[in-house]
């Protein structure tokens, strides 16, 4: 089986204040098995944004269907942008498990908030 | 074996209408995005367009956009570009490609199909 | 946009680096196209993918902002113009091109 990838395609998203930002996220394999998480920042003072799992997060919505069994996209969108919300966002693949443990990040995507235009 | 074939091209006068087409097979054309794009004479690749793999969701180059439409059918395997307002810098050859999972990369290319805008 | 050199020249037999930088992509993909109106060919999709009709003789790795196409071994059939792409859509997809001649 292929070995899995996580794609962030953006570097860097730039978004104005009050505005949705789409932050992008493919894998190219099914395997392994387990959710997708999407964090801010990194090591342990990182902040959950979004688990496939739980929820409700609500202001994060998923671009695709991700409750399709063959899906691989999993962008989210996070609405009403604040400049709390500047960040790197990591897209990371968990392995199934007592507990899920991580398995692979992708390369992480920086926002950053413009202010909001007069 | 992946095939791309895109219809003939041709030539056409500034502000008409052309349409082309790319017939797909040997791979799972529903479950793909497919992307048009093309190359002037002695210029490199210019992406302009590519559709979501049920066609909901279309994306486009600035230079084409409000000119061009792309569009697909999927039962019959088969990917389209809609050109109107047609402008000698639209002259080029145009190739139909298959998406990977990431729709920026392409896998499979057509041999691409020439379209000259002259009067 | 993204950045690669004009051309390069490899010996026959010999490796050839070709780069990629800048832009806003984390990922890079290159393609290959032997005479200009031919068809480009896949050679490399998402940093390190190589399509199954592919020589292993071509490999890519990505660091950072910079994406190299390696060929390892380099043939005469192997000159051509050598495009990357990016996977931001902001980057306009392609590089202008590395045109490699054979010496």
């Known amino acids: 089986e292929e070995e899995l990838q996580i794609i962030q395609p953006d570097k860097s998203v730039s978004v104005a204040a009050g505005e949705s930002a789409i932050l992008h996220c493919t894998i190219t394999s099914l395997f392994p098995v387990g959710p997708i998480q999407w964090f801010r920042g990194a090591g342990p003072a990182r902040v959950l944004i979004y688990n496939q799992r739980q929820g409700p997060f609500p202001r994060v919505t998923t671009v695709s269907e991700t409750t399709k069994r063959e899906n691989m996209d999993f962008s989210i969108s996070i609405s009403n942008i604040t400049p709390a919300d500047a960040g790197t966002y990591y897209c990371i693949k968990f392995r199934k498990g007592s507990p899920d443990t991580e398995f692979k990040s992708g390369a992480g995507t920086e926002l950053s908030v413009r202010a909001k235009p007069s | 074996d992946v095939q791309l074939v895109e219809s003939e091209g041709g030539v056409v006068r500034p502000g008409e209408s052309l349409r082309l087409s790319c017939e797909a097979s040997?791979?799972?054309?529903?479950?793909?995005?497919m992307t048009w794009v093309r190359q002037a004479p002695g210029e490199g690749l210019e992406w302009v367009s590519t559709i979501s793999d049920t066609g909901d969701t279309a994306y486009y180059a600035d230079s084409v956009k409000g000119r061009f439409t792309i569009s697909r059918d999927n039962s019959k395997n088969s990917l389209y570009l809609q050109m109107n307002s047609l402008r000698a810098e639209d002259t080029a050859i145009y190739y139909c490609?298959?998406?990977?999972?990431?729709?920026?990369?392409?896998?499979?290319w057509g041999l691409g199909t020439l379209v000259t805008v002259s009067s | 946009a993204l950045t690669q050199p004009a051309s390069v020249s490899a010996n026959l037999g010999g490796t050839v680096e070709i780069t990629c930088s800048g832009g806003n992509s984390n990922h890079y993909g290159w393609y290959q196209q032997k005479s200009p109106g031919s068809a480009p060919v896949t050679l490399i999709y998402a940093d390190t993918n190589r399509p199954s009709n592919i020589p292993s003789r071509f490999s890519g790795s990505t660091s950072g902002s910079t994406s190299t196409l390696t060929i390892t071994g380099v043939q005469a059939e192997d000159e051509a113009v050598y495009y990357c792409?990016?996977?931001?859509?902001?980057?306009?997809?392609f590089g202008a091109g590395t045109t490699l001649t054979v010496l």
């Open positions: 792409g990016g996977s931001s859509t902001g980057d306009g997809i």
């Open positions: 040997g791979f799972t054309f529903r479950n793909s995005y």
């Open positions: 490609a298959k998406s990977w999972i990431w729709w920026t990369f392409f896998d499979y």
